[in-house]
């Protein structure tokens, strides 16, 4: 049998990805991160 | 608030043709993801599905009727029309249209049903 | 097509027992979607259906919460904690997952 009309079944959040780079000092190198709506995941 | 009715002949013939309107308010068919079915019941019997129609004119049908349904849209006068060819005394049933609407943010079932109205088909 | 299968057909119930209803599908009905399309309707007497249960257990707005849906796959159940005399009336299920949709027989809910 056809399946019957429906929408998917996720909706798509659209959000700004910013990866940024921060120098911590000359011993410790630098930091990468990622931060997803306003959040730092990375 | 949502309504539907339907409205047609309360008797029909044996081979004829019935025409049956669903005229509603409360919403629109111009709306995405709007849609607006039949169902028909036989006395004393279970429900049975026979056509859906949405807002982009994509139309669905229970194959047993195919043949014999059209289902279509006034989407300015807010009603659908419902046509069955060769009718039979078996299809003497209430016929109900019912919305139904598309979209995660909706409910995906049928929300609101008309008050039916019965067809008796008999020479 | 999915063939649903109610059962009982016929439920006597006391007013503040609990009631439950089956209905099997002869096919799974999960869509491609993920979502399964089991609802549930209740047709009281001279009146039209009216939608209790959606996507299997999410209540319809104003259906009171004595009123409960579960299940999965094909096994599909409608529990009502407490009956109450106006919840008389012909309860179906309905899958909207495969065309052509389909309702159970009904099951026929009755004060004892």
């Known amino acids: 049998d056809a399946e019957f009309r429906h929408d998917s079944g996720y909706e798509v959040h659209h959000q700004k990805l910013v990866f940024f780079a921060e120098d911590v000092g000359s011993n410790k190198g630098a930091i990468i991160g990622l931060m997803v709506g306003g959040v730092v995941i990375a | 608030q949502v309504t539907l009715k339907e409205s047609g002949p309360a008797l029909v013939k044996p081979t004829q043709t019935l025409t049956l309107t669903c005229t509603f308010s409360g919403f629109s068919l111009s709306t995405s993801g709007m849609g607006v079915g039949w169902i028909r019941q036989p006395p004393g019997k279970a429900l049975e599905w026979l056509a859906h129609?949405?807002?982009?004119?994509?139309?669905s049908y229970n194959p047993s009727l195919k043949s014999r349904l059209t289902i279509s849209k006034d989407t300015s006068k807010n009603q659908v029309v419902l046509t069955m060819t060769n009718m039979d005394p078996v299809d003497t049933a209430t016929y109900y249209c019912?919305?139904?609407?598309?979209?995660?943010?909706?409910?995906?079932?049928?929300?609101?049903w008309g008050q039916g109205t019965t067809v008796t088909v008999s020479s | 097509d999915v063939v649903m299968t109610q059962s009982p057909l016929s439920l006597p119930v006391t007013p503040g027992e609990p009631a439950s209803i089956s209905c099997r599908s002869s096919q799974s009905i999960l869509h491609s979607n993920g979502n399964t399309y089991l609802e549930w309707y209740l047709q009281k007497p001279g009146q039209s259906p009216q939608l209790l249960i959606y996507?299997?257990?999410n209540r319809f707005s104003g259906v009171p919460d004595r009123f409960s849906g579960s299940g999965s796959g094909t096994d599909f159940t409608l529990k009502i904690s407490r009956v109450e005399a106006e919840d008389v009336g012909v309860y179906y299920c309905f899958q909207a997952t495969r065309v052509p949709l389909t309702f159970g027989q009904g099951t026929k809910l009755e004060i004892k």
């Open positions: 996507k299997v257990s």
């Open positions: 129609i949405w807002w982009d004119d994509d139309k």
């Open positions: 019912a919305r139904r609407q598309l979209g995660l943010r909706s409910i995906d079932a049928m929300d609101y």
